[in-house]
Amino acid sequence: KSPIFGPEEVNSVEGNSVSITCYYPPTSVNRHTRKYWCRQGARGGCITLISSEGYVSSKYAGRANLTNFPENGTFVVNIAQLSQDDSGRYKCGLGINSRGLSFDVSLEVSQGPGLLNDTKVYTVDLGRTVTINCPFKTENAQKRKSLYKQIGLYPVLVIDSSGYVNPNYTGRIRLDIQGTGQLLFSVVINQLRLSDAGQYLCQAGDDSNSNKKNADLQVLKPEPELVYEDLRGSVTFHCALGPEVANVAKFLCRQSSGENCDVVVNTLGKRAPAFEGRILLNPQDKDGSFSVVITGLRKEDAGRYLCGAHSDGQLQEGSPIQAWQLFVNEESTIPRSPTVVKGVAGSSVAVLCPYNRKESKSIKYWCLWEGAQNGRCPLLVDSEGWVKAQYEGRLSLLEEPGNGTFTVILNQLTSRDAGFYWCLTNGDTLWRTTVEIKIIEGEPNLKVPGNVTAVLGETLKVPCHFPCKFSSYEKYWCKWNNTGCQALPSQDEGPSKAFVNCDENSRLVSLTLNLVTRADEGWYWCGVKQGHFYGETAAVYVAVEERKAAGSRDVSLAKADAAPDEKVLDSGFREIENKAIQDPRLFAEEKAVADTRDQADGSRASVDSGSSEEQGGSSRHHHHHH
């Protein structure tokens, strides 16, 4: 017998979609061999309709796909826009069609529900609203109007025009009688439940001359949309529940065992601890739609998710809902990178951020996740030369090492830098990744003086002491600016005396600035790297002042000047409040973002989720001096 398994019979109706899962033993050969879905002909044979090697028959063009899940030993065939012509016998299988590794599936597509013997069919989604229209004749205009539900053999009164409401419908039903011109009354039922489904009878009048109309109410549980995303990648759930719930609390929950649906995030401020640092709920549109982004996908994130609206911010009977079944593909295209990076206070971290290597020209971004409200991620730096003002001199985004990875360096670490950061681009939205920075106890490895004052026209020498642990690393000095850190010539001055228990392999490397000018003012970094991979860095601010006395300055670790307490704005620069703009990359249609910078005032978009609070001034050039 064949080891392939699947549904023997699939029954659906015209216009629907089906998702057919075929199971196979997950041996390494099976995992990587061709998967196919074919239709059996009258004379034997099986005509391929779709395969894992990219073939799609013209019959299926634009309405079918086949996705392999090698780690589960399954593949799924999705077919949309079914018609009765799709009814027939099929095979799902592995290898070549004529070989025995297959499973027979019978697909039967029947005609959709229509009007049967004067019964009006209403097909409505769970949690939504239905309006049942009931016509009547003039002679019954003044008589009692009522709606009954057929329960078994007996009609049970649901509502009538004298004010009766069946307890099962309290607070969610009303009977409207149209103006005198129209001989029609309507019954509106909100927050539809599955138990509301069934046969209804509306009636005007109570005698033998009464007008009657049958209605068949079908309440559909939403079909889960199948979503396949890569491990470590990102998923966006777009939830459109309709304008009638625009002002009701929204939620996303994940079904656990049984009936429970555990809240992942809601608009009342609840967020599941497992999603801390890697989830954003974007602000609602006027039509009540919203979306939720989850990054850093884990194997255990797979499952069924429901979004909905209810005043409690969680799933309740009658909540309008949308459903997804999320599969997390463990054979991910997104490379492993550390999810936690530890840095010592006063020192630095170098974070490697993956991106889709096909999009090397995309703009790279780094943002800081904030848990306030529904989560937001204000941008800190990008690859086009923008750095948030508070991070000047200590944050740099480098395109190196390239080929699918960029680097973010943050130095002068303090406990306030602990938190979750997102790497993203304006290209493939699935490649958003999350890293947590933790600040730990310890001493920085690199030793540099505190901030330094240079004198115009003179020479300045700034030392950087490297311990022996970095003996095999390349050591460098560079001058920080918004676009990166430009390498500068430096001198190896031999072993350093700044370290106890450190042999000849320690190093003192100096930066020399000859004939200092105003342009030399700014931040300088010394650091270590191996090829294109960056390690620890240390930063020094060099201020430039008028000559007081002749001579050159050689700065030691002890005699550096203290840093000024505040930055002073250049008189020519107008600091304009930075508006927090909804970032189109994280939400909306997920389209590639246009550059949202306003060149005139230096304001800047933030990856925001609902707040329009000020975002500190932004910087494209050096606006500040000391």
Epitope: E8, E9, N11, N16, N72, T74, K221, P222, P224, S257
Partner: nanobody
Framework: QVQLVESGGGLVQAGDSLRLSCAAS????????MGWFRQAPGKEREFVTT??????????YYADSVKGRFTISRDNAKNTVYLQMNSLKPDDTAVYYC?????????????????WGQGTQVTVSS
Amino acid sequence: QVQLVESGGGLVQAGDSLRLSCAASGRTRTTYGMGWFRQAPGKEREFVTTITWSGSTNYKYYADSVKGRFTISRDNAKNTVYLQMNSLKPDDTAVYYCAASTVLTDPRVPTEYDYWGQGTQVTVSS
């Protein structure tokens, strides 16, 4: 919680038919699939058949040993699943359990099911 109650078991002759019912009550709104497993004395619980649904689409799965003889169906309005068993054999003797699931990755695996009935005995004599 979802409660499942099986009925219809009994003693029949080989070649006869039997129809089992499984009525679900309670919070059935997120139930995604219902099926039948069986357990003969001294043996492990084994998959028989399952029906899963999504909107107005039904998917029916059968074990090789019952293909062509057993049929699963459901009455959505009554929250009931039926198992029609034809051409019964002595090997079909077992306690038949109804099971329901909210999320089903593989219908053949008992641990994928969240709710179970108490079981109904089916005995097929030769």
